[in-house]
């Protein structure tokens, strides 16, 4: 069909903010559970600790986590799991000061990746019981279909 | 021509990851050599330590470098060289801890810029022999044509 | 109208760089005044310390500030004010070293948000007389209409 001016710009987008963060007892990771703050289009679905890709394609992904932790380095790993394998897409790493009053850093990263239908995207902090600030303007995750 | 739904969204994209990083003896810089990890469209060409712009226009550029270096500040400069002159587009700067075990930081920055046909884009770390982590999910460079 | 190949990709964009930064005597904030470095489209208008949204829609916003300050944590808040209320969209936070020679960090963040006609977007550093580096490639603000 012929595209109208309005249709032209309708990139699917999803901007997510945290519900909570938990650590499994047997795992040295902290996972974030997400909820949509902004959605346009139907190709992405928040699903517990992950986001399911329903519409394959090239996406701009971005992730920020706000850390309040004196562990010497903190950061997050954004991964996709699908077709029986897991792949790290990008990471953010931040050295943290040892004094609790100063140990406050956001870590932002982003990139463009091809995602497949059925992929599950997740943000993992490779630390058990990581001290995160779950403010929606400090910790968030987003997708733009290009 | 009338655009189909598929054509509509085909932004040219290029996401690059490192091959290696080297320093010239006569200059206090470290340069990264790039290879494509994801390419869509033909307007961008990885070329050694730079990326050649074949299709002029407005681009979202992003750059991340993962540093493992105790030099007190580290960072990268993204520049374009063309039409006989060099221009810094953006830079990322990160203070580093003095203890080697803690000296681990990614530095991400991005922006929207008009690039000209024939421009060469490069990422330079203004430190000779900078200690970088060249993992493809820690150090990368990307372009999206808008 | 039918979109040509050229029209197809014309996202409105605005990339701004600092004119100056000031603190009001009665306020614990530093504000940045912006000027356009790159503009495409008419939906965004730099206006003193803010950017006025003339064309409602979903935007990718990005912000970087380069700090040269020993205050223990520094960062910026990107907010929108409109329809009688103010809303924080996102924040960037960076712990700073206590030694002036090392206190040098850029702080970048970005996200996708729905902006309304008449909204005023601003970047605020919640510190009076914050020491910023106003280099156009160190401190900047940008918008891409999606």
């Amino acid at each position: 069909a012929v595209l109208t001016q309005k249709q032209k710009k309708q990139h699917s987008v999803l901007h997510l903010v945290p519900i909570n963060a938990t650590s499994k007892d047997d795992s040295d990771v902290t996972e974030v559970m997400w909820q949509p703050a902004l959605r346009r289009g139907r190709g992405l679905q928040a699903q517990g600790y992950g986001v399911r890709i329903q519409d394959a394609g090239v996406y701009l992904l971005y992730s920020q986590v706000l850390f309040q932790d004196v562990t010497f380095t903190m950061g997050q790993v954004v991964s996709r799991e699908g077709q029986g394998r897991q792949e790290t897409l990008f990471r953010c790493i931040r050295s943290m000061p040892s004094h609790p009053d100063r140990a406050y850093n956001s870590c932002y990263s982003a990139g463009v990746f091809h995602l497949h239908q059925g992929d599950i995207l997740s943000v993992i902090i490779p630390r058990a019981r990581a001290k995160l600030n779950l403010s929606p303007h400090g910790t968030f995750l987003g997708f733009v279909k290009l | 021509a009338v655009l189909t739904q598929k054509q509509k969204k085909q932004h040219s994209v290029l996401h690059l990851v490192p091959i290696n990083a080297t320093s010239k003896d006569d200059s206090d810089v470290t340069e990264v050599m790039w290879q494509p990890a994801l390419r869509r469209g033909r307007g961008l060409q990885a070329q050694g330590y730079g990326v050649r712009i074949q299709d002029a226009g407005v681009y979202l550029l992003y750059s991340q470098v993962l540093f493992q270096d105790v030099t007190f500040t580290m960072g990268q400069v993204v520049s374009r060289e063309g039409q006989g002159r060099q221009e810094t587009l953006f830079r990322c700067i990160r203070s580093m801890p003095s203890h080697p075990d803690r000296a681990y930081n990614s530095c991400y920055s991005a922006g929207v810029f008009h690039l000209h046909q024939g421009d060469i884009l490069s990422v330079i770390i203004p430190r000779a022999r900078a200690k970088l982590n060249l993992s493809p999910h820690g150090t990368f460079l990307g372009f999206v044509k808008l | 109208a039918v979109l040509t190949q050229k029209q197809k990709k014309q996202h409105s964009v605005l990339h701004l760089v600092p004119i100056n930064a000031t603190s009001k005597d009665d306020s614990d904030v530093t504000e940045v005044m912006w000027q356009p470095a790159l503009r495409r489209g008419r939906g965004l208008q730099a206006q003193g310390y803010g950017v006025r949204i003339q064309d409602a829609g979903v935007y990718l916003l990005y912000s970087q500030v380069l700090f040269q300050d020993v205050t223990f944590t520094m960062g910026q808040v990107v907010s929108r004010e409109g329809q009688g209320r103010q809303e924080t969209l996102f924040r960037c936070i960076r712990s700073m070293p206590s030694h002036p020679d090392r206190a040098y960090n850029s702080c970048y963040s970005a996200g996708v948000f729905h902006l309304h006609q008449g909204d005023i977007l601003s970047v605020i550093i919640p510190r009076a007389r914050a020491k910023l580096n106003l280099s156009p490639h160190g401190t900047f603000l940008g918008f891409v209409k999606l």
Partner: antibody, heavy 121, light 107 residues
Framework: QVQLVQSGAEVKKPGASVKVSCKAS????????MHWVRQAPGQGLEWMGY????????KYNEKFKGRVTMTSDTSASTAYMELSSLRSDDTAVYYC??????????????WGQGTTVTVSS | DIVMTQSPSTLSASVGDRVTITCKAS??????VAWYQQKPGKAPKLLIS???NRDSGVPSRFSGSGSGTEFTLTISSLQPDDFATYFC?????????FGQGTKLEIK
Amino acid sequence: QVQLVQSGAEVKKPGASVKVSCKASGYTFTSYVMHWVRQAPGQGLEWMGYINPYNDAPKYNEKFKGRVTMTSDTSASTAYMELSSLRSDDTAVYYCARGLGYALYYAMDYWGQGTTVTVSS
Amino acid sequence: DIVMTQSPSTLSASVGDRVTITCKASQNVGNNVAWYQQKPGKAPKLLISSASNRDSGVPSRFSGSGSGTEFTLTISSLQPDDFATYFCQQYNIYPFTFGQGTKLEIK
């Protein structure tokens, strides 16, 4: 306190080379770069480049590339600037000046007393 | 290279006067500008960095302002020790460049 002490005046013939030294004290030598700036008689200041003692790597002004060599000796906390193929218009006072280790975005906060180099046949 | 254009080249003033020296950069240099004072036969001395930050030990009568392409050095009340040559410098982009200098002399 921070001090930069430079070597004495030099008189050279055209085509010769000159090597000027700058001994630093009162701070950690490898945490700062050493800039070199020259000033021709009655003229302004001209930045020649810097040496980073942390990695002994230089950054040169393109105008001087091929003729200038900047080095450092961390054990002696001393920076050196050698200029070759001297011409009469290289007659100037040569200064070393300290800058922070991330050279861009930092001013030169301490200067040596200057070394006069005269090029004459 | 970025050109730093200083004005005036020479300035005649009296003790107690308020004087202003301006410096224009040929392109945006943010606030990465320094001002130096130089007396005959001496090395330059840093007065102001980051366009407006006084270096330690510099008297409060010296102030700097500006960002982008236009910068000023102001001496609020001239003292006998202030008669010298003043240089601006940009350190935003290599090569670092200086203004041609302003000679401040006694009227």
